[in-house]
């Protein structure tokens, strides 16, 4: 009931708790001498459902039949309205609409660990919308019974607080849950189980790993388990992998040897336990152990390439480059690279350890036959050395690949194609495609990239260290024994018109013609490979179309003569540059007047 109901009563029939779809009768009646002063026939009783009027009656009582109430709680309040005064609250009632409980389903019980307590869960079924009490009952051998009640609004779990022990692991226990509310009751089907069925072991703990003689091939995993554990599942994976390796072991007694781990790899290990071959459930997985396996000596061989540069009549510069071993080949942290340079006829050799980078430059005589060997070393040993005889890679003209082309292939890729050399193509043992950013000064500090291609291939897609709007000098080498031939081309993955034209820095007169000199366009403004320069000129103050001269682009060229200018006429000159995408804006303008005699 709501408030003290001093002035009257509200009664609800058949009950304050009703089944969904039922009808209730609500009666509001005034107590004696609680009506409107003087005029009892002017008593107006009004029935509210929440804050809306739903019925009224003049007199001492009001009877109202109510249908269609929704699930949940509905509040009814009865008020008295007298002439010329505010309504007075008489009394009220809450009506609870719900359903009888459904049969609880999927009752299952578990004891976490040998020392844990029995707890059960079930599915309640649809919400009753009413206060519903759940009673869980467990009966065991020797007529032992335990009971626990739950009065939470949403009850689907109860812990008996008792511990089943392994003295008689085959003894049967039966659990049942009963739901009761004002509209009915329902019991689950009984669930019968033994100790072995419901005890779920605690996950293993104190997991450790040992590598005998710091070797990955002699690895043992150790852990601790509850006393009755019979089975274990081990799972392990490299930390950067999503796929687990799984091993099932019986009577492991807290240790297992792992034979297939990779060296120098961080692994994650987890273990789970079970008490019986086919009864009960697996424990949760243990906390992860993360451990790095020991190093092993590197496998595989370095991919080595080189460049030769003429210094003077007696000396040459050799630059060696090599690629890092893959993680699976390095099998550890590479501490240094060992480079051995040897003159083959004289037997002189020098060895150097290189740390921190993957290149080495030295100067050697131009005479003699030279060879290099490069290997990678970690804490356990060295890779097999890669041996290379130093030769003139472009000496054999007949081995030069033909019709080399370089075309953009999607984002930041260049497709290089070629035809085999004229000399017997079957003599080619491999092709090497080499690329580096084009720098007008021929800067040897620019990083070198290369890839190897089988002798039957006539194309290669280069994508490593390729940037948009940068021109690359690309060489294709055909190697055969101790001979090599090469061809080169310029290429870019993406291009647009250059951002600026060349800057004319000087115009000089020579025997009736002029020589124009210019500064190269900065690399970052070229926007790809330059194809041509154009020199424009026209008479000053003239509205005529300018004349032009187009010069094919060559890396080292930065001057060009023009001999079609008239003497004693002042000309304005400027330059532009072109890529395959178009022409740059004008460079600076220069005026010049040829002083030579008129013809």
């Amino acid at each position: 009931k709501i408030d003290a109901c001093k002035r009257g009563d509200v009664t609800v029939k058949p009950s304050h708790v009703i089944l969904l779809g039922s009808t209730v009768n609500i009666t509001c009646s005034l107590k004696p001498r609680q009506g409107c002063f003087h005029y009892s026939r002017r008593n107006k009783l009004i029935l509210y459902k929440f804050d809306r009027r739903i019925n009224f009656h003049h007199g001492h009582s009001l009877n109202s039949q109510v249908t269609g109430l929704p699930l949940g709680t509905t509040l009814f309040v009865c008020k008295l309205a007298c002439i010329n005064s505010d309504e007075i609250q008489i009394c009220g009632a809450e009506i609870f609409v719900g359903v009888a409980p459904e049969q609880p389903q999927n009752l299952s019980c578990i004891q976490k660990g040998e020392q844990g307590t029995v707890a059960c869960t079930w599915e309640r079924g649809r919400d009753t919308h009413l206060y519903t009490e759940y009673t869980l009952q467990l009966s065991g051998p020797k007529n032992l019974t335990w009971q626990k009640q739950c009065k939470d609004i949403y009850c689907d779990y109860l812990d008996f607080g008792i511990n089943l022990t392994p003295e008689s692991p085959e003894s049967n226990f039966t659990a049942k849950v009963t739901a009761v509310n004002s509209l009915g009751s329902s019991s689950s089907l009984p669930s019968t189980f033994t100790f072995l069925d419901i005890v779920r072991p605690l996950p293993p703990w104190d997991i450790r790993i040992k590598f005998q003689k710091a070797s990955v091939s002699r690895c043992t995993l150790y852990w601790r388990d509850e006393g009755l554990v019979l089975l274990n599942r081990l799972r392990y994976r490299p930390s950067n992998s999503r796929l687990w390796n799984m091993v099932n072991v019986t009577k492991a007694k807290g240790r297992h040897d792992l034979l297939d781990l990779k060296p120098f790899t961080e692994y994650e290990f987890q273990i789970s336990s079970k008490l019986h071959l086919y009864k009960g459930s697996w424990s949760d997985w243990s906390e992860s152990l993360r451990a790095q396996t020991p190093e092993e000596e590197p496998t595989g061989m370095l991919d080595v390439w080189y460049m030769k540069r003429h210094i003077d009549y007696s000396r040459q510069q050799i630059s060696l480059f090599w690629k890092n071993l893959s993680v699976s080949e390095a099998r550890g942290k590479i501490l240094h690279y060992q480079v051995t340079l040897q003159e083959l006829t004289g037997g002189k050799a020098m060895t150097q350890n290189i740390t921190g980078h993957t290149s080495w430059t030295t100067v050697i005589p131009r005479t003699g036959n030279w060879a290099v060997a490069v290997s990678a070393a970690n804490s356990k040993g060295s890779s097999l050395p890669t041996r290379i005889n130093i030769m003139n890679l472009c000496e054999a003209g007949l081995l030069a690949p033909r019709q080399v082309s370089a075309n953009s292939e999607g984002m930041d890729n260049i497709l290089v194609t070629w035809q085999p050399p004229r000399k017997d193509p079957s003599a080619v043992q491999e092709y090497v495609v080499e690329w580096r950013e084009l720098h007008p000064g021929g800067d040897t500090q620019v990083p070198l990239n290369w890839l190897r291609s089988r002798p039957y291939n006539v194309s290669a897609l280069i994508s490593e260290n390729i940037k948009s709007y940068i021109c690359y000098e690309i060489r294709v080498y055909a190697l055969s024994g101790d001979q090599g031939g090469c061809s080169s081309i310029l290429g870019n993955s993406k291009h647009k018109a250059p951002l600026s034209g060349p800057h004319i820095n000087a115009i000089t007169e020579e025997k009736g013609s002029i020589l124009i000199s210019w500064n190269s366009i900065p690399v970052q403004e070229q926007m790809g490979c330059l194809l041509h320069y154009r020199i424009y000129w026209k008479e000053r103050d003239s509205n005529s179309q300018p004349q032009l001269c187009e010069i094919p682009y060559r890396v080292s060229q930065n001057s060009h003569p023009i001999n079609s200018l008239q003497p004693r006429v002042t000309y304005v000159l400027w330059m532009t540059a072109l890529t395959a995408a178009g022409e740059s804006s004008h460079g600076n303008e220069r005026e010049f007047c040829l002083q030579g005699k008129a013809n």
């Epitope: 009027r53 009656h57 269609g68």
Partner: nanobody
Amino acid sequence: QVQLQESGGGLVQPGGSLRLTCVASGFPFSTHAMSWVRQPPGKGREWISAINSGGDSTDYADSVMGRFTISRDNAKNTVYLQMNSLKSEDTAAYYCAKYEDCSDYDCSSRASWGQGTQVTVSS
């Protein structure tokens, strides 16, 4: 769903009479109090009368007291409004509604109103 169908409106001279009828369906009529509401042209709605679920108590707005009579027949799911001594200010569209949606206390909900019937009082 709730349906209310009004009828009986028309053109009548001042001082004349009309009887409006409202037939209800889609809900248990006998358990619901009912109201009549009107809306003069260009004005807001005005509750004018109500009858409780049993038909034994009625209420009227002061503007129609003594001239209008509300009644119901639960067997026919019907509520009536007998209008006598009509005046020109009674000209309006007349609607019936469930009392819980429109009473002298609160007539803000149009959830269960019918389509209405037009009453015009004019000479």
